[in-house]
């Protein structure tokens, strides 16, 4: 017959024949023949191989690093790579998650639009009209004014994006 | 470990059939193709038959061809050669090897045939 | 067919020198399929070399294997004394036959 130009998934064309391909977890060790399958071995510990593969050498597991701020997240399989989180206060500096950096906060003025996770950094969004904000803080929302009104009082200092607003006691010597 | 061990070597008359077994042990047996290579005394080697891992192809050397059947029972781990009709010129040491694409990696220690009267 | 004719027949040298043995082929062997094998009295063939040139595993790195096409050559390049014995090469790509050559020995000289 003549030799295949193309195999099926799964299988992989080395000198004109057809090889199954290694399952995930597995290397490759010897290709087939016409008379023996495709010769696969275990990956070691710490390594992996996510794919149907030919790969001759596993990959090694990421290493959570504790001095660039990495912890282990999930621990890696024979077929799946070690995921990396940061420590709490960090987050990730990219999708690898490679290093950690503090989380930002958010200065006076503005407050936490959304709380940093391990993967993604604090989000500010500045204190609109009627809200502020008056530390520095990766927590904190902006807060309302207070409503004087509602205390029977008067506003004596408006607020700002950074400040309150002061309420007083009523002027009672009003014609 | 990986080994391979040949057994069913002796003295046969010429005309007279003969079975050898191969026991397998330290790898899969079911996935690999198996050979057989004899040697006769003071020669070279010569490759003799080939069976693939399920049984289903079988490719024999001519000069055994309609005499030798090459066989496998993977659930006891073991490949056989039937020889019959054996011949003065039969007599050698048979080794069974595996089959990879390095050629044939693990051998067997060899059994003796002798074809006498 | 594919006829394997190795030279020379026998190789007489002392331990330390160069060993080069060859190996041609009747027809160009496809894929480098060529095997070397090491054979000392009383026992099995081992693979040495496959693939022409790929070292088999536990093999010492004395020995190398080059060619191709028609024509293979097996090195060991400081003979020790366990390397004397008798060297074969066989053809895997075109069969049947599996063909082995004639055999090189390799005696202390």
């Known amino acids: 017959p003549e030799p295949p130009t193309a195999c099926r998934e799964k299988q992989y064309l080395i000198n004109s024949q057809c090889c199954s391909l290694c399952q995930p977890g597995q290397k490759l060790v010897s290709d087939c023949t016409e008379f023996t399958e495709t010769e696969c071995l275990p990956c070691g510990e710490s390594e992996f191989l996510d794919t149907w593969n030919r790969e001759t050498h596993c990959h090694q597991h990421k290493y959570c690093d504790p001095n660039l701020g990495l912890r282990v997240q999930q621990k890696g399989t024979s077929e799946t790579d070690t995921i990396c989180t940061c420590e709490e206060g960090w987050h990730c500096t990219s999708e690898a998650c490679e290093s950690c950096v503090l989380h930002r906060s958010c200065s006076p003025g503005f407050g936490v639009k959304q709380i940093a996770t391990g993967v993604s950094d604090t989000i500010c969004e500045p204190c609109p009209v009627g809200f502020f904000s008056n530390v520095s803080s990766a927590f904190e929302k902006c807060h309302p004014w207070t409503s004087c009104e509602t205390k029977d009082l008067v506003v004596q200092q408006a607020g700002t994006n950074k400040t309150d607003v002061v309420c007083g006691p009523q002027d009672r010597l009003r014609a | 470990q990986v080994q391979l061990v040949e057994s069913g070597g002796g003295v046969v008359q010429p005309g007279r059939s003969l079975r050898l077994s191969c026991a397998a042990s330290?790898?899969?047996?079911?996935?690999?193709?198996m050979h057989w290579v004899r040697q006769a005394p003071g020669k070279g080697l010569e490759w003799v038959a080939v069976?693939?891992?399920?049984?289903?192809?079988?490719y024999y050397a001519e000069s055994v061809k309609g005499r030798f059947t090459i066989s496998r029972d993977n659930s006891k781990n073991t490949l056989y050669l039937q020889m019959n009709s054996l011949r003065a010129e039969d007599t050698a040491v048979y080794y069974c090897?595996?089959?990879?694409?390095?050629?044939?990696?693990?051998w067997g220690q060899g059994t003796m045939v002798t074809v006498s009267s | 067919e594919i006829v394997l004719t190795q030279s020379p027949g026998t190789l007489s040298l002392s331990p330390g020198e160069r060993a080069t043995l060859s190996c041609r082929a009747s027809?160009?062997?496809?894929?480098?399929?060529l095997a070397w094998y090491q054979q000392k009295p009383g026992q099995a063939p081992r693979l040495l070399i496959y693939?022409?040139?790929s070292l088999a595993t536990g093999i010492p790195d004395r020995f190398s294997g080059s060619g191709s096409g028609t024509d293979f050559t097996l090195t060991i390049s400081r003979l020790e004394p366990e390397d004397f014995a008798v060297y074969y090469c066989?053809?895997?790509?075109?069969?049947?036959?599996?063909?082995f050559g004639g055999g090189t020995k390799v005696e202390i000289k």
């Open positions: 069976i693939s891992y399920e049984g289903t192809k079988k």
């Open positions: 330290g790898f899969t047996f079911e996935k690999y193709g």
């Open positions: 027809q160009s062997v496809s894929y480098s399929y």
């Open positions: 090897a595996r089959d990879t694409s390095r050629g044939h990696d693990i």
């Open positions: 693939g022409a040139s």
């Open positions: 066989q053809q895997y790509s075109d069969y049947p036959p599996f063909t």
